[in-house]
């Protein structure tokens, strides 16, 4: 298999790539001769061979054409050659040699006549493996590769020469090259082709950031004399909207974003947001969804919450406790707070005005985090409407109408006292019938009763409220053989009284009914 030439080698001469005759100078003419041959991969090539092994004192020279130096300071000569073992050649003991010599001569122009004495010897080249005639049958030629360094070279170019002193040798290929540190990208910084110095010192090279990136630390690398990059220092990082992919900063695809410069990857747009273009630094919210000014781009877009539910007022003379349930839809945020708008109304509810500043709200009127507030210092026998706004971090960005629940009350001197006793009249698997007596102090006309109940094992995490006009009620759709907790309070025009204590009753385990049973607490 052909082994590719290393990327850090720049050829100045490669005899294998020259089409047609090489046309090098052979002196004397009957010494080195140019012939067609094949390389180790059976590719046709032009080679030079000499095999003048009969005569003593051979001195056959072969000189290449002029080779431009380009930017090289140190050059490398790679010789691939085949050397025949002298023992495989009959009749020639004593005259046959198994080495040849490599020379070079620097020159600023390429019309120089060949003169032996102007050449400087690089080395004597010997084969690691010579071959006997017997190796030739299936073309198992022992191909030797020898590399020699020359330098520093200063003139515009040079010649190479090969001196044969009586060997049987074929030059299969001659390659002259210099080493460079090749263009590379390291830590998202580009380093250009760099020719090293001939000396042992390293060349410091400053890198430039690839497109769509910026310096984190100034990128630098060192180019060694062997054409190798060493000691990367510093780096570049991809800009916002771009992520590292291989050796480049690639734009985030639609549907992805990257908010800041750095090594992070592009992230998928958070819920209820999207991007339509490449290279997004953040994602745009869908219609009717918003992101608060201080929200990070990684946060999902949200909408205002729905209105609070199940508002309950508990009037005590000129005070009222308002309770409500959390909105069904939080809008996708946790920062929900509640604001109380207080309106004092005439006997016509449409004629209202803001409450007096003397009205007090506990713990406060705005920014409530719990679902209860106590309003005090109201006027007696006065109609009030309370609007409970649910807001979150994006409510102020939204144009739709406010999300609130309203409750209207009339203050009085007092609310009814608690219901004292609850009696179970009848039970079945799915229902319980209850009755009770009116509070001892109704403090007005009782309008209705609020019955609150829940399964005992659920510890009031989920409860149900229903209204009863009289002093008895049948509660259905219950679970069989289950203990329920009940509380009842009365409501007059002044509001709700306080809850009764908790009463526990059980549904039947099977289909028969049980009557008349007081509760156990």
């Amino acid at each position: 298999e052909l082994s590719p030439q290393p990327s850090n080698e720049v050829n100045l001469l490669d005899s294998k790539t020259i089409q047609g005759e090489l046309g090098w100078i052979s002196y004397p003419s009957h010494g080195w001769e140019e012939i067609s041959g094949v390389d180790e991969h059976y590719t046709p090539i032009r080679t030079y061979q000499v095999c003048n092994v009969m005569d003593h004192s051979q001195n056959n020279w072969l000189r290449t054409n002029w080779v431009p130096r380009n930017s090289a300071q140190k050059i490398y000569v790679e010789l691939k050659f085949t050397l025949r073992d002298c023992n495989s050649i009959p009749l020639v003991l004593g005259t046959c040699k198994e080495t040849f010599n490599l020379y070079y001569m620097e020159s600023d122009d390429h019309g120089v006549k060949f003169r032996e004495h102007q050449f400087t010897k690089i080395d004597t080249i010997a084969a690691d493996e010579s071959f006997t005639q017997m190796d030739l049958g299936d073309r198992i030629l022992k191909l030797n590769t020898e590399i020699r360094e020359v330098g520093p070279v200063n003139k515009k170019g040079f010649y190479l020469a090969f001196q044969d002193v009586g060997a049987c040798v074929a030059l299969v290929s001659v390659r002259v090259y210099f080493k460079k540190c090749p263009f590379t990208v390291k830590n998202l910084a580009m380093f250009p082709d760099t020719v090293p110095m001939d000396s042992q010192s390293l060349v410091e090279v400053r890198g430039s950031c690839v497109n769509n990136s910026k310096e984190e630390d100034p990128p630098r690398m060192y180019c060694s004399t062997e054409g190798e990059w060493l000691v990367p220092i510093g780096k570049c990082t991809c800009n916002a909207g771009y992520e590292e992919r291989g050796f480049i900063c690639q734009a985030c695809r639609p549907g992805f974003y990257k908010a800041s410069d750095g090594a992070a990857k592009c992230a998928k747009c958070p819920p209820h947001s999207s991007t339509q273009e490449d290279g997004s630094m953040n994602c745009r919210c869908e219609n009717n969804y918003f992101r608060a000014e201080k929200d990070p781009p990684s946060m999902a877009c949200a909408r205002p919450p729905s209105a609070p539910r199940n508002v309950i007022s508990n009037i005590n003379e000129t005070s009222v406790i308002l309770d409500w349930s959390w909105p069904l839809d939080t809008g996708g945020r946790k920062d929900i707070t509640f604001n109380i708008i207080c309106k004092k109304c005439g006997w016509n509810v449409r004629q209202c005005e803001p409450c007096s500043p003397n009205v007090r709200f506990l713990p406060r009127q705005l920014g409530l985090t719990n679902t209860t507030v106590t309003v005090t210092d109201l006027l007696a026998h006065t109609n009030y409407t309370f609007e409970i706004d649910a807001v979150n971090g994006v409510s102020e960005l939204s144009s739709p109408p406010r999300q609130y629940a309203a409750v209207s009350i009339t203050t009085n001197q007092a609310a009814p006292s608690p219901v004292m006793t609850i009696k179970k009249d009848r039970t079945s698997r799915n229902s319980i019938s209850l009755s009770w007596q009116e509070p001892e102090h109704p403090n007005g006309i009782i309008l209705d009763y609020e019955v609150k109940y829940y399964q005992k094992q659920e510890q009031e995490t989920s409860y149900t409220i229903l209204r009863a006009r009289g002093t008895n009620v049948t509660i259905s759709s219950l679970k069989p053989d289950t203990t329920y907790v009940f509380q009842i309070r009365a409501r007059t025009a002044a509001g709700y009284g306080t809850n009764s204590r908790k009463f526990e009753f059980e549904t039947s385990p099977d289909s028969f009914s049980i009557s008349g049973e007081n509760s156990h607490v």
Partner: antibody, heavy 121, light 106 residues
Framework: QVQLLQSGAEVKKPGASVKVPCKAS????????MSWVRQAPGQGLEWMGW????????TYAQGSTGRFVFSLDTSVSTAYLQISSLKAEDTAVYYC??????????????WGQGTLVTVSS | EIVLTQSPATLSVSPGERATLSCRAS??????PAWYQQKPGQAPRLLIY???TRATGIPDRFSASGSGTDFTLTISRVEPEDFAVYYC????????FGQGTKVEIK
């Protein structure tokens, strides 16, 4: 140009001797070995051996008798084949051929025109 | 000594056709033979040596291949001047020739 020039035909009686010259020109005589090949009438080629033109050292083919001798006169760039005690079966064309050693293999790249030696009583 | 046997003894071909000549060694040799051409009344001429190297001036329609004991000389398209006798020759310490193959006009 490179050439090997041989003498004309010889007719000899059995038991006689003959010396066939081969004069080289156009190259350095001592730089290439010289080989001798014979070809009986209507027959194929038979390699007889060779001589190192530098040292004068000969090598004879297996089966060759001592009747064949290779020699040189390097001053006139000439190789000789001497056959003594000629027999009728020695009748053949005798070729000298320059030996070419190369890295990739050997062969005889330049041939003389041949000398016909006829042995007849 | 190694004996080289050439076949066929005579090969009849028309100009422009391909000719394939065989040379078989009596024992395995790693050195591919040299090949020679001889026309009537002329000295032999070296065609190929060293497995596949053509001698100076030999056209590229001549090629050689093989290894071990079986070797082949191929003339890709026979020209009129190619009708002759062809010999293979094994080299080494001792050289031997095959008996020859005559290529004649069909």
């Amino acid at each position: 140009q490179v050439q090997l020039l041989q003498s004309g035909a010889e007719v000899k009686k059995p038991g006689a001797s003959v010396k066939v010259p081969c004069k080289a020109s156009g190259y350095t005589f001592t730089s290439r070995a010289m080989s001798w090949v014979r070809q009986a009438p209507g027959q194929g080629l038979e390699w007889m051996g060779w001589i190192n033109t530098n040292t004068g050292n000969p090598t004879y083919a297996q089966g060759s008798t001592g009747r064949f001798v290779f020699s040189l006169d390097t001053s006139v760039s000439t190789a000789y084949l001497q056959i003594s005690s000629l027999k009728a079966e020695d009748t053949a064309v005798y070729y000298c051929a320059r030996v070419r050693f190369t890295v990739y293999g050997d062969g005889m790249d330049v041939w003389g025109q041949g000398t016909l030696v006829t042995v007849s009583s | 000594e190694i004996v080289l046997t050439q076949s066929p003894a005579t090969l009849s071909v028309s100009p422009g056709e391909r000719a394939t000549l065989s040379c078989r060694a009596s024992q395995s040799v790693s050195s591919n033979p040299a090949w020679y051409q001889q026309k009537p009344g002329q000295a032999p001429r070296l065609l190929i040596y060293g497995a596949s190297t053509r001698a100076t001036g030999i056209p590229d329609r001549f090629s050689a291949s093989g290894s071990g004991t079986d070797f082949t000389l191929t003339i890709s398209r026979v020209e009129p001047e190619d009708f002759a006798v062809y010999y293979c020759q094994q080299y080494g310490p001792s050289w031997t020739f095959g008996q020859g193959t005559k290529v004649e006009i069909k």
